[in-house]
Interface confidence: low
């Protein structure tokens, strides 16, 4: 089963910008200039019933 898309962090971006991600997919986070990423830059959709993200989404701090 797929994982549902996560929101981009405030003052940041995520890629790919999909609403559903197949099990095994990786999504990547980055921050706008002047902000520092706190947390995992890449997280994965771990297969399961249901599938789930390997980590919580990061945040961007000034």
């Amino acid at each position: 089963k797929p994982c549902h898309g996560l929101s981009a962090p405030e003052n940041g971006a995520r890629s790919p910008e999909k609403q559903l991600h197949p099990a095994g997919a990786t999504i990547h986070f980055s921050c706008a200039p002047g902000y520092v990423l706190k947390g995992q830059a890449s997280i994965k959709c771990v297969p399961g019933h249901p599938s789930h993200w390997s980590d919580p989404p990061p945040i961007c701090r000034a």
């Epitope: 197949p22 990547h28 890449s42």
Partner: antibody
Framework: QVQLKQSGPGLVAPSQSLSITCTVS????????VDWVRQSPGKGLEWLGV???????NYNSALKSRLSITKDNSKSQVFLKMNSLQTDDTAMYYC?????????????WGQGTLVTVSA | DIQMTQSSSYLSVSLGGRVTITCKAS??????LAWYQQKPGNAPRLLIS???SLETGVPSRFSGSGSGKDYTLSITSLQTEDVATYYC?????????FGAGTKLELK
């Protein structure tokens, strides 16, 4: 049917830059990421970086300062630029893509561009 | 970065025989492992992803297994066209990294 075709120079002088173009067909660059991988006898297969469907990039941190990956969605082209080449950058350079935008394994490969760094 | 170690650089094989190629990761990669076949002058060809999932068009004599850090590619009833170099690749952690390859050579 997915295809990736590469073009670019085969010989680069030391300290100069490398530019390779990967032209894709069978899928849209807005929906899929395209990666660059190189292969040399000394270092084996080495992932260089990726440009995702949304346009963001990730690079191998060991090469990040010398790499740039860009694309033109309308022309279905992805561009690799690498600066300050040295002899140990001599390798076969491949563009590759996965089964969907989030994958970092490679179901489709270009034919490769053999790059020789030599004076 | 996660290091991928293929313990055998070369394996001497017999047609019709069974071959087992091993790959060990320096950290747990949770089955995020791919296997590729490469023949001289060609790009790598994806055989298996997710440690066990055979790609479309790959003969059923190929199979993948393993978990944690240790993974195996098996080929049963080896055919002439299987003589090639095989690479493992992890994609659990960015950057994705490859093993150095195992080259099959006919006895």
């Amino acid at each position: 049917q997915v295809q990736l075709k590469q073009s670019g120079p085969g010989l680069v002088a030391p300290s100069q830059s490398l530019s390779i173009t990967c032209t894709v067909s069978g899928f849209s660059l807005t929906s899929y990421g395209v990666d660059w991988v190189r292969q040399s006898p000394g270092k084996g297969l080495e992932w260089l970086g990726v440009i995702w469907g949304g346009g963001s990039t990730n690079y191998n941190s060991a090469l990040k300062s010398r790499l740039s990956i860009t694309k033109d969605n309308s022309k279905s082209q992805v561009f690799l630029k690498m600066n300050s080449l040295q002899t140990d950058d001599t390798a076969m350079y491949y563009c590759a893509s996965g089964d969907y935008d989030g994958s970092l394994w490679f179901a489709y490969w270009g034919q490769g561009t053999l790059v020789t760094v030599s004076a | 970065d996660i290091q991928m170690t293929q313990s055998s650089s070369y394996l001497s094989v017999s047609l019709g025989g069974r071959v087992t190629i091993t790959c060990k990761a320096s950290d747990h990669i949770n089955n995020w492992l791919a296997w590729y076949q490469q023949k001289p002058g060609n790009a790598p060809r994806l055989l298996i992803s997710g440690a066990t999932s055979l790609e479309t068009g790959v003969p059923s004599r190929f199979s993948g297994s393993g978990s944690g850090k240790d993974y195996t590619l098996s080929i049963t009833s080896l055919q002439t066209e299987d003589v090639a170099t095989y690479y493992c690749q992890q994609y659990w952690s960015t950057p994705p990294t490859f093993g150095a390859g195992t080259k099959l050579e006919l006895k």
